[in-house]
């Protein structure tokens, strides 16, 4: 089972001191989002027991193996279901804690009930504050049963559930009809998937016989040991104040595990720590009792004394749970409760025994789960013990399970069961992922999903050029880091594969599927320089550049021109996709802007060195258009134009430009300057009689502005043909009708 413990601190006088802590003893637990260990999650589960909304609870991570929930402001915040989720992949496990209000109308005699499939479960709700009304039982939040208040027996309402099946598991509650749901008694029913003492898919396998209140897991046959006990069969007590599968965790605070509720993976549920009992786990065990919830009785023999944390403490010369075994009887010594080997390895297993008469090599044997008996190949005899060594044939998956070391002498016999886990070396299910590439290196993420078992101890990356028969190059990397493959050939495909290993002999897995990764093409090395540029309008710029002459073909696909507008902090990039190009027209620029300009050669996705920068100032855009332009014929050759100055001028006008064009004519228009900018009228002379003309005008400051509206007017008739229009008395260079 996953080594995951949810601790609830039950000092309930002050909810603000209440906390829940989830502790994981798993390798790589809670390390966050990396592929080697999903995070520990600790949360209140409001799906069944809903409490009034309050301020959000605070979650604090203490390293990678522990997470704590605080911030409870009122007692009702505590009532309900809390869960902690830990472990990776198929081992992901949820541990559940159910909290009852100490002031509720009804209180559970026992919160967690673990029963076997087919058993009768009896939930008992004790009356704490009586109400003369119906009692409603619910299962997972839905109505289940009603009792009349007269149906209480000895101040308790009982719910009998005969022949329970796994789907009956869940949260049960008993509530007076008129009471707040927070005054309910909440229970957790865990129904094992098998009958008593059995486990496995068809419940065909026999449980190891869990001691000290341990519960046999119906899926894997392992004992889920109560807090404070360890070993394959929970046969060993931890030191006072310690818990976890290997007794590696310590209860916080000076009073040890007092006031703490421990919740473990199903099918165990929750209990007080070893040596404590009561609804708030604050009462020490009565004499003669020990263990979690003080559920165990010592019954020590031969002068043994009862310790409320560990059970019988035997005097010299005696051992056994009740001190019932003489030290003359042979005894298996220091056998590890769990061993782990990799598939297809041939490990050596040692088993040591002592006793009187002294065990010899032939008196110690090893039994596999399938019943096969192995005899030791050699024995080391020391003054206080004999250690037999067994050479195990090549391991297969079916060898996973409980092995047994047995010693037999004329003084009696002893056996010790231990769990052997045969692990499958990890094999990548996917190819590694390319993160970035350059011409001579590839950056690769080796983190991939895998079949088989973790944890991953090393990652090997094998690579060689595609279609090559040369040896593979290999690099060993840290599982959690990206890898850079160096000194590669440019523009070359490489076949890259991952190999994962787990700890222990024979932990190397098969190579994963290959993937093709191609290095980038060479970087362009030539540095262009800017030959020149000229402004073709307030928003247009023509640029030209050159490249140094070098022998051989040009390494490049095109050019990138960059214009940097420092005032606005904006960059404009223009791609010229021909490596032969040496000029470009940049349009849509911002008039009146100071630009820094450079050009660089590119090849594939790589940029070469930039040219030395040039600084370009575009002329500002011109002023707004003159307003209310009006034309009035004065004679057969003269038309007077009147207008109003533009509004919101950015500076003084230097001149106006008038455009004159014969209406419907095909010729180019004529531009006439009005050099006295203070004027608001002018006379255009030298026009043809009886001719329709179009006029528009614009102002100039540093650059030409916007055109005004176009006006139309005809000269008067019967005049002679003029030589061409003039403004005031200055002649134009050519006639309008030419």
């Amino acid at each position: 089972a996953v080594d995951l413990t949810l601790l609830a601190n039950l000092r309930l006088t002050d909810p603000q001191r209440f906390f829940l802590t989830c502790v994981s003893g798993e390798a790589g637990a809670g390390r966050g989002s990396d592929a080697w260990g999903p995070p520990l999650l600790l949360e209140k589960d409001d799906r069944i027991v809903r409490t009034p909304p309050g301020p959000p609870l605070r979650l604090a991570r203490n390293g990678s193996h522990q997470v704590t929930l605080r911030g409870f402001s009122k007692p009702s915040d505590l009532v309900g279901v809390f869960s902690c989720v830990g472990g990776a992949g198929a081992r992901r496990t949820r541990v559940i804690y159910v909290h009852n209000s100490p002031g509720a109308h009804l209180l559970p005699d026992k919160v967690t009930h673990t029963v076997n499939k087919g058993d009768t479960a009896v939930l008992s709700a004790r009356v704490h504050k009586e109400k003369q009304t119906d009692v409603i039982w619910k299962s997972n939040g839905s109505y289940f049963y009603t009792l009349d208040w007269h149906e209480a027996q000895d101040g308790r309402f009982l719910l009998q559930l005969p022949n329970v099946q796994p789907p009956s598991s869940g949260i049960y509650s008993a509530t007076y009809l008129e009471a707040s749901p927070l005054g309910s008694a909440f229970f957790r029913l865990i129904v094992r998937g098998c009958g008593a003492g059995r486990w496995g898919p068809g419940c065909t396998k026999e449980c190891p016989g869990c001691l000290h209140g341990g519960v046999c897991h119906d899926h894997d046959g392992e004992c889920v040991c109560p807090p404070g006990f360890t070993g394959t069969r929970c046969e060993q007590a931890c030191r006072e104040g310690r818990f976890g599968q290997s007794c590696q965790e310590q209860c916080p605070g000076i009073s040890g595990c007092r006031g703490l509720t421990f919740c473990l993976p199903d099918p165990y549920g929750c209990s007080c720590g070893s040596g404590w009992r009561g609804s708030q786990c604050q009462e020490a065990c009565a004499p003669g009792h020990f263990g979690a919830d003080c559920r165990l009785q010592c019954q020590c023999q031969n002068g043994g004394t009862c310790d409320r944390f560990s059970g019988c403490v035997c005097p010299s010369g005696w051992h056994g749970v009740h001190c019932e075994k003489s030290d003359r009887i042979p005894q298996i010594l220091n056998m590890a409760s769990e061993l782990e080997f990799n598939l297809e390895t041939m490990p050596r297993i040692n088993c040591a025994a002592a006793g009187n008469p002294f065990p010899v090599r032939g008196s110690i044997e090893l039994r596999k789960p399938d019943g096969t008996v192995l005899l030791s190949t050699k024995a080391i005899v020391e003054p206080e013990k004999t250690t037999a060594e067994f050479e195990v044939p090549r391991l297969v998956l079916a060898d996973s399970g409980f092995w047994e070391c047995r010693v037999s002498t004329s003084g009696g016999q002893d056996s010790r069961r231990f769990k052997v886990n045969v692990k499958v070396p990890p094999v990548p299910l996917a190819a590694p992922r390319l993160l970035t590439k350059q011409s001579r290196q590839l950056v690769v993420s080796p983190l991939v999903s895998f079949s088989g078992d973790g944890p991953i101890s090393t990652v090997r990356l094998h690579y060689r050029p595609q279609d090559s028969t040369m040896d593979w190059s290999t690099i060993v990397v840290d599982p959690s880091e990206n890898v850079t493959l160096m000194n590669l050939r440019p523009k070359t495909g490489y076949s890259v594969r991952v190999q994962l290993s787990r700890p222990g002999e024979g932990g190397e897995g098969a190579w994963g599927p290959p993937t093709l990764m191609t290095t980038d093409c060479p970087e362009p090395l030539l540095q262009p320089w800017l030959e020149g540029w000229h402004v073709e309008g307030t928003d247009r710029l023509r640029v030209s550049w050159s490249l140094p002459l070098v022998p051989g073909p040009l390494v490049g696909d095109g050019f990138l021109l960059r214009l940097w507008d420092g005032t606005r902090g904006q960059e404009r990039r223009e791609n010229v996709s021909s490596p032969q190009a040496r000029t470009a027209l940049l349009t849509g620029l911002t008039p009146g802007t100071h630009y820094q300009l450079d050009v660089q050669l590119y090849h594939c996705t790589l940029l070469g060195p930039a040219s030395p920068p040039a600084h370009v100032l575009l002329p500002p855009s011109g002023p707004p258009a003159p307003r209310h332009l009006h034309a009035q014929a004065l004679s057969d050759s003269e038309i007077q134009l009147t207008w109003k100055h533009p509004e919101a001028l950015p500076g003084p006008i230097s001149k106006y430009v008038v455009e004159v064009q014969v209406a419907g004519g095909a010729g180019d228009p004529l531009w006439i300057d009005v050099d006295r900018p203070e004027e608001t009228s002018t006379i255009i002379r030298g026009l043809n009689a009886s001719t329709r003309y179009l006029f528009r005008m614009r102002a100039s400051i540093q650059g030409l502005g916007d055109w005004s509206n176009t006006v139309e007017e005809s000269t008067l008739g019967n005049g002679l043909q003029a030589e061409g229009p003039v403004q005031e008395s200055r002649a134009a260079e050519e006639g309008l009708d030419q």
Epitope: Q132, T133, D134, Y143, T146, L147, E151
Partner: antibody
Framework: EVQLLESGGGLVQPGGSLRLSCAAS????????MGWVRQAPGRGLEWVSS????????HYADSVKGRFTISRDNSKNTLYLQMNSLRAEDTAVYYC??????????WGQGTLVTVSS | QSVLTQPASVSGSPGQSITISCTGT?????????VSWYQQHPGKAPKLIIS???NRPSGVSDRFSGSKSGNTASLTISGLQAEDDGDYYC???????YTSSTTWVFGG
């Protein structure tokens, strides 16, 4: 689908007896409180009696106390109402109903009991 | 047998809203949040339309709503439709806290 089907109604003389049955289906009958409600012709509804899931506790309206007995057989998913010493004022359509918490969430179609000489 | 008081009849035009009142005492309507309403069409069994004063069971139109103030509960039907025609009964749970046994009382 929850279904309640009453039977056993009919014409009976004053002072006579009648036993009504209600066959339940579509839910876990043994988990629910059940009840009888009646409706005299042209009148409103009147609660008659209720029984708890275990069958151990029963309640009656004052108007029928001592004359009517409610019972149930959880193995047959059936509710009963034994009516003795019937009076003319007991004439009504008798409905069997399921109790959820404190209200009648499903009703049968009713069976008519007529007490007349 | 105590009976809750309801108006003999309430009428309205299609699309209108109507409210039916139900008056009891502090021992029933006033004492609990356990008021329910039932709809009955002629010749049919009653059907639950409101529980717990204002809870609508699934499948019941949201045009039906309930409320309670003091000893009086109310059922409001908005956007009246022809199929709303029928008898409506209020009911209150009166538990053993107030009487010798669990009882229900109905409006008449």
């Amino acid at each position: 689908e929850v279904q309640l089907l009453e039977s056993g109604g009919g014409l009976v003389q004053p002072g006579g007896s009648l036993r009504l049955s209600c066959a339940a289906s579509g839910f876990t009958f043994s988990s629910y409180k059940m009840g009888w409600v009646r409706q005299a012709p042209g009148r409103g509804l009147e609660w008659v009696s209720s029984i708890y899931p275990s069958g151990g506790w029963t309640h009656y309206a004052d108007s029928v106390k001592g004359r009517f007995t409610i019972s149930r057989d959880n193995s047959k998913n059936t509710l009963y109402l034994q009516m003795n010493s019937l009076r003319a004022e007991d004439t009504a359509v008798y409905y069997c109903a399921r109790v959820l918490l404190h209200y009648f969430d499903y009703w049968g179609q009713g069976t008519l009991v007529t007490v007349s000489s | 047998q105590s009976v809750l008081t309801q108006p003999a009849s309430v009428s309205g035009s299609p699309g209108q809203s109507i409210t039916i009142s139900c008056t009891g005492t502090s021992s029933d309507v006033g004492g609990y949040k356990y008021v329910s309403w039932y709809q009955q069409h002629p010749g049919k069994a009653p059907k639950l339309i409101i529980s717990d004063v204002n809870n609508r069971p699934s499948g019941v139109s949201d045009r039906f709503s309930g409320s309670k103030s003091g000893n009086t509960a109310s059922l409001t039907i908005s956007g009246l439709q022809a199929e709303d025609d029928g008898d409506y009964y209020c009911s209150s749970y009166a538990s053993s806290s107030y009487t010798s046994s669990t009882t229900w009382v109905f409006g008449g």
